[in-house]
């Protein structure tokens, strides 16, 4: 569950649960910083724009975001 | 089966101190956000504290800021709520509850059982 | 800080009958972040309704959430006997505290 703040991390809870790629409208992933210590990702589904945090450690998370860095390479001129 | 079982209630004087727990069992506690709220005696939900799945984030009530502290031992599958400075009217049910992670926000999905703290001299 | 208010207070109706409980914001809320929840006597609090109107995972068809903006609603379609019980809204803003509403207590005519 991510939760809009002005400083610390962003998200509350984290999902192990894999995502379709054609599902996804945005991907976000967010960099540690003085104001979060860890890596965050944010996925916005093209359904009802609803939000999730993924969890970076997953196994099933890091194939979604090789899927999705490939399809975007494919896209790139 | 996914369960909450709150401890660590009991009667306090004013002013004392108690501390809460909450084991958590059957599902990946170190991915979920875990939440407070009590119920004074005949009144409605009050929501107490918030802490993230790693413990990084806390929030709290303004009744409750600078008094109690939120946290958890993701290796013991425990929440906890540290009660300083403790009134009469902290006088509840005490409810732990689940932050559900599949989603932006599907509520407080799995409840305890409650645990009763009662301040009274 | 949001403050929702809930109306009516007590509800008293038949079974069968139907139900609708409002929810009022004092300000916006998102419908993301909008739940409901049943509460019996000497029980924990139930989720009945997530995102405003999405049923919880084991909650029958006759509860239905709608609503946006600073109105929300929840209605039971047919009471069972089971549905006597107290109903929170509960809101989950940009930032805490998540508060809850007061309460519709719906109790048996």
């Known amino acids: 569950v991510p939760l809009s703040r002005t400083v610390r991390c962003t998200c509350i809870s984290i999902s192990n649960q894999p995502v379709n790629p054609r599902s996804l409208e945005k991907l976000e992933i967010i960099p540690a910083s003085q104001f979060c210590p860890r890596v965050e990702i944010i996925a916005t589904m093209k359904k009802k724009g609803e939000k999730r945090c993924l969890n970076p450690e997953s196994k099933a998370i890091k194939n979604l975001l090789k899927a999705v860095s490939k399809e975007m390479s494919k896209r790139s001129p | 089966q996914v369960q909450l079982v709150e401890s660590g209630g009991g009667v306090v004087q004013p002013g004392r101190s108690l501390r809460l727990s909450c084991a958590a069992s059957?599902?990946?506690?170190?991915?979920?956000?875990m939440h407070w709220v009590r119920q004074a005696p005949g009144k409605g939900l009050e929501w107490v504290a918030l802490i993230g799945y790693d413990g990084i984030n806390e929030y709290y009530a303004d009744s409750v800021k600078g008094r109690f502290t939120i946290s958890r031992d993701n290796s013991k599958n425990t929440l906890y709520l540290q009660m300083n400075s403790l009134r009469a009217e902290d006088t509840a049910v005490f409810y732990c509850?689940?932050?559900?992670?599949?989603?932006?926000?599907?509520?407080?999905?799995?409840w305890g059982q409650g645990t009763t703290v009662t301040v009274s001299s | 800080e949001i403050v929702l208010t809930q109306s009516p207070g007590t509800l008293s109706l038949s079974p069968g009958e139907r139900a609708t409980l409002s929810c009022r914001a004092s300000?916006?809320?998102?419908?993301?972040?909008l739940a409901w929840y049943q509460q019996k006597p000497g029980q924990a609090p139930r989720l009945l309704i997530y995102g405003a109107s999405s049923r919880a995972t084991g909650i029958p068809d006759r509860f239905s959430g709608s609503g946006s903006g600073t109105d929300f609603t929840l209605t039971i379609s047919r009471l069972e006997p089971e549905d006597f019980a107290v109903y929170y809204c509960q809101q989950y803003g940009s930032s805490p505290p998540f508060t809850f509403g007061p309460g519709t207590k719906v109790d048996i005519k």
């Open positions: 059957g599902f990946t506690f170190s991915n979920c956000g």
């Open positions: 509850a689940r932050d559900w992670p599949e989603g932006y926000y599907n509520g407080m999905d799995v």
């Open positions: 300000q916006s809320v998102s419908s993301s972040y």
